[in-house]
Interface confidence: low
C-alpha cells in the first residue's frame, strides 16, 4: 500500500531462465518419394535458443523446406499468383508476398498450374498451414526455472526471488506454492485463461509479470515477488498483421560444393518476463 | 499534459517485430582462381536473426572469410604488423589487433611482405573496407511490422498499438498515416534525418521511440502511441571506438573430417524500440 | 542530489557492446581411440554470440558431446538411474533428468552397469563436471567496449558515455580513468569482489551498472555516467536451482545423409548492463 512518507524507487532487475523437458515428435517424412512416419526427440538445444535476459522462446511447431538452393524456379501458386503468359510476369519485380525476384517468364509449377519464375532459394517455400495439432504440443509439460535478482540502488538493497529455504523440486501454484519459481508451461497458460494446445499451433507471446512491492523499513520489512500471467499477442489479430509468433531461420550446408539450406519456419511461445515494482523506505 | 491531480504510472511493455523483404546481392565471387559476378537472393532467414523483444537487426553489408581452418599462417599485414626477422615476433604474444597467437617466426605473407606467423583460424581475415555501396543496400525498401502491447498494472489497463480498424497494407507516414505500425526502413531513416545508403555501409543503430501519453480517466480517455525516430550510434565516432555496427559470426562445417568455418563480418542496422510513457488517472 | 524544484525524468537508454580478445584452449582430444593434447584458438565468433542491447555473453568453459544421432541407446548411469531388469524401465516414460524417452528395456551401458534404453540423441550426454580450470580462463584478459546513448525525451536532451576527447586505448580504472568505457573483464570481477578464475568454471551473471545523475539546468549542467559492478547470480545456490550460467546449443550436420549434431554445453559469463538514473531540470 502507498505510504506517503516513504521515498519510492523503481526496481533494477536481472533475469535468468532455464527450460527443462523433452518432446517426442511424430511427423510424416518423405524420402525417395516414399512417405513414412518419423519419430524424433527434441531437447532444449533443439527447441530453444540462447536468449538474453528477459525473454525465452520455446518452439512448439514448425514447417521445414529442405534442400533449398539458389537458382531459378516457379514461385508458389498462392492466391492471385498464377499466370498464363509471360505478360503477367515482370522482370526484376519483387512481390512483397513472394520469396524471389521475377525473371519475366511464366513457367509450369505443376501439371495444372503456372506461376512466374523467380530467382530465389528453390524450391520455394510452400505456404502451408502450421501442422495441427502442434508437433511439440507436449511442451505443455516443460518447466522453466526463473531466477530474478533485483536491486534498489538508492536504498542499497538487493534480493532475489529464490531463497535458501526453497525446495528445488517444487512447482509454482497460485494457492499451494506461490513463491516457487519453477513453472510448468501449461500451468502458466491455464493461469492466464489460455489454451496451450491451441496457441502452440501458431505460436504466441506470454507475459510472466513479476511484481515486487517492497517495504524496506526495518520495522515492517517485506520484499517478495508476486507472479501473474497474461497473454501479450492478440489472438483475434487479422491475418495481414501476422497472428501468433513465428520466425524463419536456416541451417546452411554444402553438398557437392553447392551451398544449400534447410529453411525452418518455427512457431512457438515467446515468454516475456516483465519485472516491475517499487521499493519504499522512510 | 501534466494533470497534477492524477496518479501517474510508468508503462510495462512488450514488443514483437516482423521484417519483410528480399534483396538481390551482386558481388565478385572467386572460384578456382577465376573471378566472376555472382547473384544471390537474401530473404529474412539470411539477413536477420531471431531476436528478442525490443531489438531487431537487418544485415546490410558483409565481408566473408571462407574456408578457414585452425593452423599456422602469417598474420594480416596491417599497418605496423610487418616484420623482417624473427626478432620482431614474440612467441605466445597476442596482439589485441591480431587474430591469433604468435609462434615467434617471421614468415612471408606474399611476394613482397613478411609478417609474424600466428596460430589462428587461417588464412586470417583480411582487414578490408566494408563494400561500398553496401551489398544489401536495397534493404531500404524492407518493411517492419511493430506490434506493441502495453500495460499499466496499477490501473489494470491494457492496450496495443494495432487496432482492429487498421489496414494491413498501410505504411507509416507522419502526416498521412501516423497510427500505421508498418514502417519502411528507408522512411525511418528519412524521418531521423539520416541517409540509409550511407549508414548501410558500416552499419548503425536506429532508435524507434514509441511514446504513450495516456489519460485513463473515463471522461477524457486517450491512449494512443506516438512514433519518433533518432539515430543512436555516433556517426562522428573515432575509428578506435568502432564506428557503425557490426559483429562477426561463423558457419562451421567439416571437410574430410577437418573442422572449417566461414567467418562473416556482418554490418547492419540494429533497430532499438524504446517504449516509454505514463498512464494517469484521477 | 535531490533538488525539489526540479522536474525529474527517468532515462531512456540504448547500449552497444564490442568484445575483443583471443583465447588459446588446450584440451584432451580423442580420435580413433587415441587421446592427445589439442590446441585451438577461440576468437569472438567462437566464444560470443550476436546479442541484443543490454546483455553480452562470453563463453569461458564447455563440454562437448560429438557425433550424436537420433536412435536408441542406454541412458547415462547417473545416481539412481541404473536398472537390473526391464521392470525398472517404463515404455514412454520421460525422466526429467534423462535426455530421452524410455523404450521399456534395460540394456548394458558398459561392462559393469545397465541403464534403461532411451530414444534420444545418442550417445547421450555424459553428466560430467565442467572442466577445472576453465578452458577459456584467459578470457579474464578480454576487453569490452561499452557504448551507451541516453535520452531524456521530456527535456529533449541526448548524450552518450563516449566523448570526442576520449582515448581509444584507455582501460577503465575506478581511480585513474573512471570515464573510460573499455573494461577488462578481470577488472570488472575484481571491482565486484569476485574471482574470475573461479566463476569461469561454472559461469555466472555479472551486472555492469551505469548510473546517470543528470542536472540539466544550464547554469549547473552535469551529466556523466558512474560505473559500478556486482554479481547477479547466487554463488551459494543449491544444486537443484542450477548454479552458475550455462546453456546447451547444437551444431547440426549431415554425414552419409544422416543428420548428426555436436551438442555444446556452454558455460560462461553473461554481462547485464543496467542503465538507470534521472535527469532533473528547473
Amino acid at each position: 500500500s502507498d505510504k506517503l512518507y516513504q521515498r519510492k524507487e523503481p526496481v533494477i532487475s536481472s533475469v535468468h531462465t532455464k527450460v527443462k523437458g523433452i518432446a517426442e515428435v511424430t511427423e510424416n517424412v518423405t524420402e525417395g518419394g516414399v512417405t513414412k512416419l518419423g519419430h524424433s526427440i527434441f531437447d532444449t538445444a533443439d527447441y530453444t535458443f540462447p536468449l538474453q535476459g528477459n525473454s525465452f522462446f520455446v518452439m512448439t511447431n514448425y514447417v521445414k523446406s529442405e534442400g533449398q538452393v539458389q537458382t531459378l524456379c516457379p514461385e508458389y501458386p498462392r492466391r492471385g499468383a498464377q499466370c498464363s503468359s509471360d505478360r503477367r510476369c515482370k522482370k526484376g519485380w519483387m512481390d512483397p508476398q513472394s520469396k524471389g525476384i521475377q525473371t519475366g517468364r511464366c513457367v509450369p509449377y505443376d501439371k495444372t498450374r503456372k506461376t512466374c519464375e523467380v530467382s530465389a532459394w528453390c524450391p520455394t517455400e510452400e505456404e502451408k498451414e502450421a501442422p495441427r495439432p502442434a508437433l511439440l504440443r507436449s511442451a505443455e509439460n516443460f518447466t522453466v526455472l526463473i531466477k530474478n535478482n533485483i536491486h534498489f540502488p538508492g536504498h542499497n538493497y538487493t534480493t532475489r526471488n529464490i531463497l535458501p529455504t526453497m525446495n528445488g523440486s517444487c512447482t509454482f501454484h497460485k494457492a499451494w506454492d506461490p513463491q516457487c519459481s519453477i513453472f510448468r508451461l501449461g500451468d502458466i497458460f491455464q493461469e492466464a485463461g489460455e489454451n496451450f494446445t491451441e496457441v502452440a499451433v501458431q505460436g504466441g507471446i506470454m507475459g510472466i509479470e513479476i511484481y515486487w512491492d517492497c517495504n524496506l523499513d526495518s520495522w515492517s520489512h517485506h520484499c517478495r515477488p508476486r507472479y501473474s500471467f497474461r497473454r501479450l499477442d492478440d489472438k483475434n489479430m487479422d491475418e495481414s498483421f501476422v497472428p501468433g509468433y513465428n520466425f524463419r531461420y536456416a541451417k546452411y550446408y554444402k553438398e557437392n560444393n553447392v551451398e544449400k539450406r534447410t529453411l525452418i519456419k518455427a512457431f512457438g511461445i515467446r515468454f516475456d518476463i516483465l519485472v516491475f515494482g517499487t521499493g519504499g523506505k522512510f | 499534459s501534466d494533470k497534477l491531480y492524477q496518479r501517474k504510472e510508468p508503462v510495462i511493455s512488450s514488443v514483437h517485430t516482423k521484417v519483410k523483404g528480399i534483396a538481390e546481392v551482386t558481388e565478385n565471387v572467386t572460384e578456382g582462381g577465376v573471378t566472376k559476378l555472382g547473384h544471390s537472393i537474401f530473404d529474412t532467414a539470411d539477413y536477420t536473426f531471431p531476436l528478442q523483444g525490443n531489438s531487431f537487426f537487418v544485415m546490410t553489408n558483409y565481408v566473408k572469410s571462407e574456408g578457414q581452418v585452425q593452423t599456422l599462417c602469417p598474420e594480416y599485414p596491417r599497418r605496423g604488423a610487418q616484420c623482417s626477422s624473427d626478432r620482431r615476433c614474440k612467441k605466445g604474444w597476442m596482439d589485441p589487433q591480431s587474430k591469433g597467437i604468435q609462434t615467434g617466426r617471421c614468415v612471408p605473407y606474399d611476394k613482397t611482405r613478411k609478417t609474424c606467423e600466428v596460430s589462428a583460424w587461417c588464412p586470417t581475415e583480411e582487414e578490408k573496407e566494408a563494400p561500398r555501396p553496401a551489398l544489401l543496400r536495397s534493404a531500404e525498401n524492407f518493411t517492419v511490422l511493430i506490434k506493441n502491447n502495453i500495460h499499466f498494472p496499477g490501473h489494470n489497463y491494457t492496450t496495443r498499438n494495432i487496432l482492429p480498424t487498421m489496414n494491413g497494407s498501410c505504411t507509416f507516414h507522419k502526416a498521412w498515416d501516423p497510427q500505421c505500425s508498418i514502417f519502411r526502413l528507408g522512411d525511418i531513416f528519412q524521418e531521423a534525418g539520416e541517409n540509409f545508403t550511407e549508414v548501410a555501409v558500416q552499419g548503425g543503430i536506429m532508435g524507434i521511440e514509441i511514446y504513450w501519453d495516456c489519460n485513463l480517466d473515463s471522461w477524457s480517455h486517450h491512449c494512443r502511441p506516438r512514433y519518433s525516430f533518432r539515430r543512436l550510434d555516433d556517426k562522428n565516432m573515432d575509428e578506435s571506438f568502432v564506428p557503425g555496427y557490426n559483429f562477426r559470426y561463423a558457419k562451421y562445417y567439416k571437410e574430410n573430417n577437418v573442422e572449417k568455418r566461414t567467418l562473416i563480418k556482418a554490418f547492419g542496422i540494429r533497430f532499438d524500440i524504446l517504449v516509454f510513457g505514463t498512464g494517469g488517472k484521477f | 542530489s535531490d533538488k525539489l524544484y526540479q522536474r525529474k525524468e527517468p532515462v531512456i537508454s540504448s547500449v552497444h557492446t564490442k568484445v575483443k580478445g583471443i583465447a588459446e584452449v588446450t584440451e584432451n582430444v580423442t580420435e580413433g581411440g587415441v587421446t592427445k593434447l589439442g590446441h585451438s584458438i577461440f576468437d569472438t565468433a567462437d566464444y560470443t554470440f550476436p546479442l541484443q542491447g543490454n546483455s553480452f555473453f562470453v563463453m569461458t568453459n564447455y563440454v562437448k558431446s560429438e557425433g550424436q544421432v537420433q536412435t536408441l541407446c542406454p541412458e547415462y548411469p547417473r545416481r539412481g538411474a541404473q536398472c537390473s531388469s526391464d521392470r525398472r524401465c517404463k515404455k514412454g516414460w520421460m525422466d526429467p533428468q534423462s535426455k530421452g524417452i524410455q523404450t521399456g528395456r534395460c540394456v548394458p551401458y558398459d561392462k559393469t552397469r545397465k541403464t534403461c534404453e532411451v530414444s534420444a540423441w545418442c550417445p547421450t550426454e555424459e553428466e560430467k563436471e565442467a572442466p577445472r580450470p576453465a578452458l577459456l580462463r584467459s578470457a579474464e584478459n578480454f576487453t569490452v567496449l561499452i557504448k551507451n546513448n541516453i535520452h531524456f525525451p521530456g527535456h529533449n536532451y541526448t548524450t552518450r558515455n563516449i566523448l570526442p576527447t576520449m582515448n581509444g586505448s584507455c582501460t577503465f580504472h575506478k581511480a585513474w580513468d573512471p570515464q573510460c568505457s573499455i573494461f577488462r573483464l578481470g577488472d570488472i570481477f575484481q571491482e565486484a569482489g569476485e574471482n574470475f578464475t573461479e566463476v569461469a568454471v561454472q559461469g555466472g551473471i555479472m551486472g555492469i551498472e551505469i548510473y546517470w545523475d543528470c542536472n540539466l539546468d544550464s547554469w549547473s549542467h552535469h551529466c556523466r555516467p558512474r560505473y559500478s559492478f556486482r554479481r547477479l547470480d547466487d554463488k551459494n545456490m543449491d544444486e537443484s536451482f542450477v548454479p552458475g550460467y550455462n546453456f546447451r546449443y547444437a551444431k547440426y550436420y549431415k554425414e552419409n545423409n544422416v543428420e548428426k549434431r555436436t551438442l555444446i554445453k556452454a558455460f560462461g559469463i553473461r554481462f547485464d548492463i543496467l542503465v538507470f538514473g534521472t535527469g532533473g531540470k528547473f
Partner: nanobody, 127 residues
C-alpha cells in the same frame, strides 16, 4: 536412493477417520505420479488412490470412493490420504509409491510399476 516415509497409521474404531502422510526426500515429487496402495493380510496389493502429475487429476478404487481423499502439500513435500468412515475391510498395510502410471485416470491392481516405495504404515480398523 529416494525415500518415501509414511506415517499416521494406527488402530481406530469403525466409522472413525485417519490421515496418512507420505513425505518424500531428495526427489522430484512434482515429476512423478503418486499413489497410495494397500495390502491386507493374505491378499494381493491393490491400488487405493493416485494423483497424476501431468494434470493434477486423481483416481480412486471403487471401494473407497467418497470416503478417501488424496491431496498434496508442495511446501511440506508431502502427500496425504484422508480416510473417513473407516471399515474393518480397510485394515491393511498402506504404502505410498511414486513413479510413472501408464493408464491415465486409473489406479488399479496390475497397472502400477512404481519406481519408489515406502516401508508402509499399518492401519487397523476394529471394534
Amino acid at each position: 536412493e529416494v525415500q518415501l516415509v509414511e506415517s499416521g497409521g494406527g488402530l481406530v474404531q469403525p466409522g472413525e477417520s485417519l490421515r496418512l502422510s507420505c513425505t518424500a526426500s531428495r526427489f522430484m515429487l512434482d515429476y512423478y505420479d503418486i499413489g497410495w496402495f494397500r495390502q491386507a493380510p493374505g491378499k494381493e496389493r491393490e491400488g487405493v488412490s493416485c494423483r497424476f502429475t501431468n494434470d493434477g487429476s486423481t483416481a480412486y478404487a471403487d471401494s473407497v470412493k467418497g470416503r478417501f481423499t488424496i491431496s498434496r502439500d508442495i511446501v511440506k513435500h508431502t502427500v496425504y490420504l484422508q480416510m473417513n468412515s473407516l471399515q474393518p475391510e480397510d485394515t491393511a498395510v498402506y504404502y505410498c509409491a511414486a513413479g510413472p502410471l501408464t493408464k491415465r485416470r486409473q489406479c488399479v491392481p496390475g497397472d502400477f510399476s512404481m519406481d519408489f516405495w515406502g516401508e508402509g504404515t499399518l492401519v487397523t480398523v476394529s471394534s
